[in-house]
Interface confidence: medium
Amino acid sequence: MAVTACQGLGFVVSLIGIAGIIAATCMDQWSTQDLYNNPVTAVFNYQGLWRSCVRESSGFTECRGYFTLLGLPAMLQAVRALMIVGIVLGAIGLLVSIFALKCIRIGSMEDSAKANMTLTSGIMFIVSGLCAIAGVSVFANMLVTNFWMSTANMYTGMGGMVQTVQTRYTFGAALFVGWVAGGLTLIGGVMMCIACRGLAPEETNYKAVSYHASGHSVAYKPGGFKASTGFGSNTKNKKIYDGGARTEDEVQSYPSKHDYV
């Protein structure tokens, strides 16, 4: 039960996280104009990964896309790449985790396969979250560097003359959305990995005591059971008895006089 809850919660947290990463990637406010000396401006500039915008006091807003690819800073391209990789990995992870959910039965999919898929999606969520956090952090570092460079330029006036005006940009809402979303995806991934660890052992413990020997001629060997964690070669969950290996289906098709525990 706890494993199902952990897996379900991990899925939901990751889902929220990935939705947040997508939202952050699409948002225009990655960097917003620093209103250091004028808290209410007539014109407010802000920039995203894909376009930059200007909003006026009249309400008029225009955004223009970055139509060049080669002319963009390498760092911006890197941030774009990290965010896209994060979204793609997260989306695949979500798809895999849906089939891995313990509460959803799909055909005759065994729990070892679900454990495998849970771990895979967990790792994908972790990498997705790290990509998002890395992307946002790289952009934030870029902003900090540019901010202090433009601040230095602002105050290098000589002989009573002031240098040309420079617009400084500071952290936009998208950065905080990205950091939180990346963190949630990361946490969700860790929860999925924890759920995976609990999936297989819980099942094998149950199966180890599920069956009794069908007759006196067959001696039950507790040590003979090979636990399947989903990573070994015993993927068929075969129970090993002295009387030969029989599959789970075979055991169930010959009920003994003993009741199941």
Epitope: V40, T41, V43, V54, F60, E62, R64, V165, Q166, T167
Partner: antibody
């Protein structure tokens, strides 16, 4: 970077006139608003209208200029001001001006043309 | 709506003196105010924007202050070259306004 006005001349009352502003050294873009400001002889500056330099069409007019004056972009380097129903009160030097939106975060005029004189007289 | 009132209309001061020009907005424009200097036969030149920030190449003798509706331009250590007409301009909105500029102040340096 320069602005140059043209089209100013003597006009009779009730007449119409179109002024043209040509930019050199830069082209209109989303960082700018292109404006017209006038100054009657011996009087102060009077703002008339502005047009956005970006792709979206956005214009602003002084309340008194709406209807009689029309600002438009004819190319990426030229802006015009169409004036109708002119009176003697419209006699002034008409300046073409550029507001630098992005850098100054407000409607600050950073570049002016030398002006063109419009005289309305019979 | 957003009318700009400039005082005085003219002022006369000796070289080395100080001139103070006031500008009042009918509604708050926060710090979105610019000051221009215009000499006869020339177009205006930007001096100050954002109420107190000096434009490129403007000497520090020019000082802007104020916010909201009350603004001041102070010119200290007056020079002959400062003789001109000074205009304030609200740079906050372009919607429903009669004129963005104040009436102007003529500064005479004696």
């Amino acid at each position: 970077q320069e602005l140059k006005e043209s089209g100013g001349r003597l006009v009779t009352p009730g007449g119409s006139l179109t002024l043209t502003c040509t930019a050199s050294g830069f082209s209109f873009n989303s960082n700018y608003y292109m404006c017209w400001v006038r100054q009657a002889p011996g009087k102060g500056l009077e703002w008339i209208a502005c047009i956005y330099g970006g792709t979206t069409v956005n214009t602003y007019y002084a309340t008194w200029a709406k209807g009689r004056f029309a600002i438009s972009k004819t190319s990426s380097t030229t802006v015009t001001l169409q004036m109708t129903s002119l009176t003697a009160a419209d006699t002034a030097t008409y300046f073409c001006a550029r507001e630098d939106l992005t850098a100054y975060s407000s409607y600050v005029i950073t570049l002016w043309g030398p002006g063109t004189l419009v005289t309305v007289s019979s | 709506a957003y009318d700009m009132t400039q005082t005085p209309a003219s002022v006369s001061e000796p070289v080395g003196g100080t001139v103070t020009i006031k500008c009042q907005a009918s509604e708050t424009i926060y710090r979105n105010l610019a000051w221009y200097q215009q000499k006869p036969g020339q177009p205006p030149k930007l001096l100050i924007y954002a109420a107190s920030t000096l434009a490129s190449g403007v000497p520090s003798r020019f000082k802007g202050s104020g916010s909201g509706t009350q603004f001041t331009l102070t010119i200290s250590d007056l020079e002959c070259a400062d003789a001109a007409t000074y205009y304030c301009q609200q740079a906050y909105t372009r919607v429903n306004i009669d004129n963005a500029f104040g009436g102007g102040t003529k500064v005479v340096v004696v």
